[in-house]
Amino acid sequence: ALDTNYCFRNLEENCCVRPLYIDFRQDLGWKWVHEPKGYYANFCSGPCPYLRSADTTHSTVLGLYNTLNPEASASPCCVPQDLEPLTILYYVGRTPKVEQLSNMVVKSCKCS
Amino acid sequence: ALDTNYCFRNLEENCCVRPLYIDFRQDLGWKWVHEPKGYYANFCSGPCPYLRSADTTHSTVLGLYNTLNPEASASPCCVPQDLEPLTILYYVGRTPKVEQLSNMVVKSCKCS
């Protein structure tokens, strides 16, 4: 699987999950998030050669098409597969609120 | 929606579904598919600016991150959202077989 266990331990050029730390205030301008200051959102990148973690029949077909027609602009793209939530603390006036934001952390990638 | 109804009628630079005809024999080397000869598989391409048909909270966050950090390599990617099946005819020896291949035709795209 193209997950953090594999991708963070290997120098993988093809589609894989990459570490990306986002600081809410500095990188997003989100001053309202009090905790955490930031988090590892991670991201997916790298080429998607034929059959590499193909998401659907279409991505398999497109991968093969791209292999046999290298000049073509159409090819699968490396995108998130498994995502995990992130719990944040913020304030509404003087009242603290805790919320779980879904699909915030990329744990693995796929070619789609 | 970034679907064929919209994308095929507009000159859209950003993420959209694009027409792509694939000939089974010529483009994939699949001699075993007898009908159809080929089909419009289509594909997704184009930049994913902030909030454009964002698939998850992560893609929204990544889009904003990319807007505020233009030099960053991390950005959402334009990939298939809705896919449709394709019915094909092939022969096993002298016996005709009809099969519905799932997720073969891209009907719309999203930023993921």
Partner: antibody, heavy 119, light 111 residues
Framework: EVQLLESGGGLVQPGGSLRLSCAAS????????MSWVRQAPGKGLELVAD??????????YYSDSVKDRFTISRDDSKSTLYLQMNSLRAEDTAVYYC??????????WGQGTLVTVSS | DIQLTQSPSSLSASVGDRVTITCRAS??????????MHWYQHKPGKQPKLLIY???NLASGIPSRFSGSGSGTDFTLTISSLQPEDFATYYC?????????FGGGTKVEIK
């Protein structure tokens, strides 16, 4: 260009044998099913024998009229189709065509070879 | 085995005529939306030639005056404007199941 060249036809006495050959070129012979179709004088086309590719275990078919007398075979290394005809009868007199059916239709045909069974 | 019955068995026509040949199968030769019937032209001393495959698809190099239609058990070959070179015998053939069989043929003669 697809070419199918039959040979081996001729005059033979009833009860005799003949071996027809069909040399194929211009296509991937290994991948496709091959057949022998005949036309007897004043009659229509009849599928006599058929053999599919190695992928499908060289499965064969014979019409009832030739079963146990004719044997179809192929040599993929030589791109050649064969029809071994034994115990020939007068009613086997016909033009025999070699043909290739990539799918459900016989797309290409040889020029035919005449087999005459007569005493 | 699936039997194919062609009609008429022979016909006389003139150059420029519209000619229709039918082929009826003893059971359906269609599967899903695919119609597994094919048509051939056969001239004396020549090898048969594929005209139409899967009911309505024109084979490579065949003039557009030839067309095919039908589904299930009933199929038609049409020559929109008969030409001198079209006088021949025409056969239908199915590939719905093994064994594939041919129709008895329709001989198109000059009137």
């Amino acid at each position: 260009e697809v070419q199918l060249l039959e040979s081996g036809g001729g005059l033979v006495q009833p009860g005799g044998s003949l071996r027809l050959s069909c040399a194929a070129s211009g296509f991937d012979f290994n991948s496709y099913g091959m057949s022998w179709v005949r036309q007897a004088p004043g009659k229509g086309l009849e599928l006599v024998a058929d053999i599919v590719s190695k992928t499908y275990n060289y499965t064969t078919y014979y019409s009832d009229s030739v079963k146990d007398r004719f044997t179809i075979s192929r040599d993929d290394s030589k791109s050649t189709l064969y029809l071994q005809m034994n115990s020939l009868r007068a009613e086997d007199t016909a033009v025999y065509y070699c043909t290739v059916a990539p799918g459900g239709s016989f797309d290409y045909w040889g020029q035919g070879t005449l087999v005459t069974v007569s005493s | 085995d699936i039997q194919l019955t062609q009609s008429p068995s022979s016909l006389s026509a003139s150059v420029g005529d519209r000619v229709t040949i039918t082929c009826r199968a003893s059971q359906s030769v269609s599967i899903s939306r695919f119609n597994l019937m094919h048509w051939y032209q056969h001239k004396p001393g020549k090898q048969p030639k594929l005209l139409i495959y899967r009911a309505s698809n024109l084979a490579s190099g065949i003039p557009s005056r030839f067309s095919g239609s039908g589904s299930g058990t009933d199929f038609t070959l049409t020559i929109s404007s008969l030409q001198p070179e079209d006088f021949a015998t025409y056969y239908c053939q199915h590939s719905r199941e093994s064994p594939w069989t041919f129709g008895g043929g329709t001989k198109v003669e000059i009137k």
